[in-house]
C-alpha cells in the first residue's frame, strides 16, 4: 500500500501526507477547483495544493511538511458551470514582484536593466526553467517524505507548532471565497491592508493542475483584525463579490469539504453549522452535508493551519 | 510552507550602525521577492527596501544612501546595513516574502536609536 502511494505520487499525485500501513489512498485526480469551493475551515486548508484523504482522529500526523508554491501564472483555468465568471478586470496582472510601490526610490538596476528583446525573452525562459526546477524539487521531497526518507540536506524543515498554536492561529485567520483566478497574494493583502498587520496570504492552488482554486486565506497579528476584516464581507474586488468569513477551526474526523466520491466505507455523519453562517454554506458553492457518501476532503489534517 | 527569522536587532546610539538578517527557510522559491519593513509605535507598516525578482533594488525616500540591502539566494537569507541611524529609524524591522500566491511576514526585531 505504501509503496503504491509513493509510486501514484511519484507519478504526478505528490499530496498526501504519511504512507503507513493500512493508510487509504483514492488516486482520483482532484475534482473542483471552482471559485470559493471548500469550506472555510480546515486549518488544513491552508497548504498551498497537497491534498490528501480524510483522516480518522488516529491517523493524525503531528508535524507539518513544506508545501509546494506554483509560482507561475498557470494558464486561466475555464469557470465550472455554476461559479461566477472572471468578472471585469480580472486580466492578469504582470508579475507583481516587477512593480515599485510608489514614494519609492529606484536603486541600483543590477541585472534588471532593460536590455534587447532577445536578451529578455532569454531571461523569461530562464526563470521559468527555474521555477520549474524548484516545482521539481518540491515534488521530490514530497515523495521522499512518502517513502519515508529524509529530504536532501539544506532544506530546512518545518517549525512544528502545537495544535494549541494552530487553533490560536485559526483564531486570527479568515476565509475569504469567490477570489479571481487572476489575483495575487499582493493584491489580497492590499485589499485587507486597513484591517490590521497580516502575518500571511495563501491563495489555495489545485495541487494536479496548478490552477488557483478561486479562494484564499488571511492570518492576522490579532484576533481583533479577524473582526474588521468581516466588514468587507461583500465587497469587490478584482470585480468579484468576494466572501469574508472567520476561519473555522476543523474537529478531528469531520471533513471540510465534500467533493462526492464514495469512500470505500459508507460513514454518516452530521455536521453543525451555527445560524451566522447557513447563509454561506446554503448559497455559494456548497453541497449538501451529511449524507451518507463522504467525499475525499482536501485538508491535509483537522489541526494543521496551513 | 516559509518560514523567517529576522535577527541583529538592538539599541544603538545615533550615527551607529546595524546589520540586520533575515534568514527564510521552507519551501522557498528563488523569483519570490523579499523585502525589509517597518513599523515605528502607531504607525502603519513602511516599506524600507525591497529587491524585484528582476534584480532591481528599491529604498524608501527616508533611507536611501544610509541603507543597504542585500540578498544571496544560495543562502535563503536577505540582510539590511543600516548606517548613520536616526532616532526616528527607532521601530520593529520586519521581514517579508512575497511570492504570486504566497505572502509570509516574519516576527521582527526591534531597532531602538537613542540620541
Known amino acids: 500500500m505504501a509503496a503504491a502511494a509513493a509510486a501514484a505520487a511519484a507519478a504526478g499525485a505528490a499530496g498526501g501526507r504519511g504512507s503507513g500501513p493500512g493508510r487509504r489512498r483514492h488516486l482520483v485526480p482532484g475534482a473542483g477547483g471552482e471559485a470559493g469551493e471548500g469550506a472555510p475551515g480546515g486549518a488544513g486548508d491552508y497548504g498551498n495544493g497537497l491534498e490528501s484523504e480524510e483522516l480518522e482522529p488516529e491517523e493524525l500526523l503531528l508535524e507539518p511538511e513544506p508545501e509546494p508554491e506554483p509560482e507561475e501564472e498557470p494558464p486561466r483555468p475555464r469557470a465550472p458551470p455554476g461559479a461566477p465568471g472572471p468578472g471585469p478586470g480580472s486580466g492578469a496582472p504582470g508579475s507583481q514582484e516587477e512593480e515599485e510601490e510608489p514614494g519609492l526610490v529606484e536603486g541600483d538596476p543590477g541585472d534588471g536593466a532593460i536590455e534587447d528583446p532577445e536578451l529578455e525573452a532569454i531571461k523569461a525562459r530562464v526563470r521559468e526553467m527555474e521555477e520549474e526546477a524548484e516545482k521539481l524539487k518540491e515534488l521530490q521531497n514530497e515523495v521522499e517524505k512518502q517513502m519515508n526518507m529524509s529530504p536532501p540536506p539544506g532544506n530546512a524543515g518545518p517549525v512544528i507548532m502545537s495544535i494549541e498554536e494552530k487553533m490560536e492561529a485559526d483564531a486570527r485567520s479568515i476565509y475569504v471565497g469567490n477570489v479571481d483566478y487572476g489575483a495575487t497574494a499582493e493584491e489580497l493583502e492590499a485589499h485587507f491592508h486597513g484591517c490590521g498587520s497580516v502575518n500571511r496570504v495563501t491563495i489555495l492552488c489545485d495541487k494536479f493542475s496548478g490552477h488557483p482554486k478561486g479562494f484564499a486565506y488571511i492570518e492576522f497579528s490579532d484576533k481583533e483584525s479577524v473582526r474588521t476584516s468581516l466588514a468587507l464581507d461583500e465587497s469587490l474586488f478584482r470585480g468579484r463579490q468576494i466572501k469574508v468569513i472567520p476561519k473555522r477551526t476543523n474537529r478531528p474526523g469531520i471533513s471540510t469539504t465534500d467533493r462526492g466520491f464514495p469512500r470505500a466505507r459508507y460513514r454518516a455523519r452530521t455536521t453543525n453549522y451555527n445560524s451566522s453562517r447557513s447563509r454561506f454554506y446554503s448559497g455559494f458553492n456548497s453541497r449538501p452535508r451529511g449524507r451518507v457518501y463522504r467525499g475525499r476532503a482536501r485538508a491535509t489534517s483537522w489541526y494543521s493551519p496551513y | 510552507a516559509v518560514q523567517l527569522v529576522e535577527s541583529g536587532g538592538g539599541l544603538v546610539q545615533a550615527g551607529g550602525s546595524l546589520r540586520l538578517s533575515c534568514a527564510a527557510s521552507?519551501?522557498?522559491?528563488?523569483?519570490?521577492?523579499m523585502g525589509w519593513y517597518r513599523q515605528a509605535p502607531g504607525n502603519q507598516r513602511e516599506l524600507v527596501a525591497t529587491?524585484?525578482?528582476?534584480?532591481?533594488?528599491s529604498y524608501a525616500g527616508s533611507v536611501k544612501g544610509r541603507f543597504t540591502y542585500s540578498r544571496d539566494n544560495a543562502k535563503n537569507t536577505v540582510d539590511l546595513q543600516m548606517n548613520s541611524l536616526k532616532p526616528e529609524d527607532t521601530a520593529v524591522y520586519y521581514c517579508?516574502?512575497?511570492?504570486?500566491?504566497?505572502?509570509?511576514w516574519g516576527q521582527g526585531t526591534l531597532v531602538t536609536v537613542s540620541s
Open positions: 521552507g519551501s522557498i522559491v528563488s523569483l519570490a521577492t
Open positions: 529587491m524585484s525578482s528582476s534584480g532591481i533594488t
Open positions: 517579508k516574502y512575497s511570492s504570486r500566491w504566497n505572502i509570509y
